[in-house]
């Protein structure tokens, strides 16, 4: 039995970015018909993970897992169920807390992003890593890059693979 | 507001092992009063991640995130809620699907473990990685090591930090 997942293509792209493996990222992005500018934007984010070394990939993976398995995300599922007691209302949609984190990573200030991460993982090393990654992304990505990253996210969230 | 997490110390230990950073692992294990034999057992698992390189850490992180955010885990929360419509029944307990995966990693055969992973992430590269890690752990760990790893897991699951 293949279990239904919460937007698997999102996690595929996230871990491909964090991995620093261009081939893996290209494979994931092809699945959602990413344009060349969208790929360029994602590769700039990937560069930040690579430059920041292994620790950033592991710590950011930890943050993502913590948020994805938090009561905040679980609460979403529960809320839907309380409303109509049907499991299928869980959908395959990504949890709003994860969406918020990603939005803040792209469109929030470093302080705003780190504040969000701190709600889930307050370890100083985790927060410091989050700030370094965020500052790197802000330095590398132009307004246009960020628009392209956001349009790619729209494709991911609305993809049949989500 | 600090969000309640699902057994945060478990994820701390998991990512410390996958990271290959001994210091980070030692810090996490100290929090649950791990004995020397328990530390040795965890370091043998950590060695497998290190030997298998970066890709294994990223892919295993992806598997862990996918399981933790799957409907299987969500379903647990939902089930409890349907029973008494109280959010606090979510507890901070780790999701049974995650527990099952960890148990199979330690006590199952490679086929059994890979079969479990395949329910969540069927990418060939993920399954191949899972098999390599599992074979490595089986080769490195004695009966006694596995007993120690299991006793450490008990400490983690029953810790106030979970």
């Amino acid at each position: 039995v293949k279990m239904a997942e919460t937007c698997p293509i999102f996690y595929d792209v996230f871990f491909a970015v964090a991995n620093g493996n261009e081939l893996l990222l290209d494979l994931s992005l092809t699945k959602v018909n990413a344009t060349e500018p969208e790929r360029t934007a994602m590769k700039k984010i990937q560069d930040c993970y690579v430059e920041n070394g292994l620790i950033s990939r592991v710590l950011d993976g930890l943050v993502m897992t913590t948020i994805s398995s938090s009561k905040d995300c679980m609460g979403e599922a529960v809320q839907n169920t309380v409303e109509d007691l049907k499991l299928n209302t869980l959908g395959r949609e990504i949890c709003p807390a994860v969406k918020r984190g990603v939005d803040l990573f792209l469109t929030g200030t470093p302080d705003e992003y780190v504040e969000q991460v701190a709600q889930y993982k307050a370890l100083p090393v985790v927060l410091e890593n989050a700030r370094i990654l965020k500052n790197c992304v802000d330095a590398k990505m132009t307004e246009e890059d960020k628009e392209n990253a956001l349009s790619l996210l729209d494709k991911i969230y609305t993809s049949p693979l989500c | 507001v600090k969000m309640a997490e699902t057994c945060p110390i478990f994820y701390d230990v998991f990512f410390a092992v996958a990271n290959g950073n001994e210091l980070l692992l030692d810090l996490s294990l100290t929090k649950v009063n791990a004995t020397e034999p328990e530390r040795t057992a965890m370091k043998k698992i950590q060695d497998c991640y290190v030997e298998n390189g970066l890709i294994s850490r990223v892919l295993d992180g992806l598997v862990m995130t996918t399981i933790s955010s799957s409907k299987d885990c969500m379903g647990e929360a939902v089930q409890n809620t349907v029973e008494d419509l109280k959010l606090n029944t979510l507890g901070r307990e780790i999701c049974p699907a995650v527990k099952r995966g960890v148990d199979l990693f330690l006590t199952g055969t490679p086929d059994e473990y890979v079969e479990q992973v395949a329910q969540y992430k069927a990418l060939p590269v993920v399954l191949e990685n899972a098999r390599i890690l599992k074979n490595c752990v089986d080769a490195k760990m004695t009966e006694e090591d596995k007993e120690n790893a299991l006793s450490l897991l008990d400490k983690i699951y029953t810790s106030p930090l979970c």
Partner: antibody, heavy 119, light 107 residues
Framework: EVQLVESGGGLVKPGGSLRLSCAAS????????INWVRQAPGKGLEWVSL????????YYADSVKGRFTVSRDNAKNSLYLQMNSLRAEDTAVYYC????????????WGQGTTVTVSS | DIQVTQSPSPLSASVGDRVTITCRAS??????LAWYQQKPGRVPQLLIY???TLQSGVPSRFSGSGSGTDFTLTISSLQPEDVATYYC?????????FGQGTKLEIK
Amino acid sequence: EVQLVESGGGLVKPGGSLRLSCAASGFTFRNYNINWVRQAPGKGLEWVSLISGSSSYIYYADSVKGRFTVSRDNAKNSLYLQMNSLRAEDTAVYYCARRTLSYYVMDVWGQGTTVTVSS
Amino acid sequence: DIQVTQSPSPLSASVGDRVTITCRASQGISNYLAWYQQKPGRVPQLLIYAASTLQSGVPSRFSGSGSGTDFTLTISSLQPEDVATYYCQKYNSAPYTFGQGTKLEIK
């Protein structure tokens, strides 16, 4: 041309409600965070609220928290500010302003709409 | 919340003068400070962001400096069209507080 146009201002009694709108054009609205900023007659600028492109995060100034609600409809390229329990001190010109993605500052402002709270 | 204090207000200077307006944050905000210009009866316009980066189209006589808690807006040679109220704003995180404004007049 990148443009923001506010509407919905007017005269309202204390305790009353009003809904302001901000229509956007010339840019991909759904990608941008938008602020509401107000300016009381003869006074300085006061930040009121911010809503992110996908509404995933929203911030309010303490002075309006619990009384004002910001929302957006990306399909209509529109932003809204629902103002309840209005007070005399809410009298001001209300501007919507786009926040840039790369530097987080307000680079495009609307012309403003006037709200007067008086009995 | 972080407070933002501007000085002086008001400010009177002659055409051609070098004019300096200061802005102080009650806590460090790195370089997350912007300056806006509002001419009488007009909408505010972004002048400077990231403490010292000039917004496209803004004359080069305007410059900004500072980091942490103390910031400065300088007009190297005041022009008649610079008559306006100038606001600093911290934007590292909400609330995005503005300074009280500095009204600049020509002597």
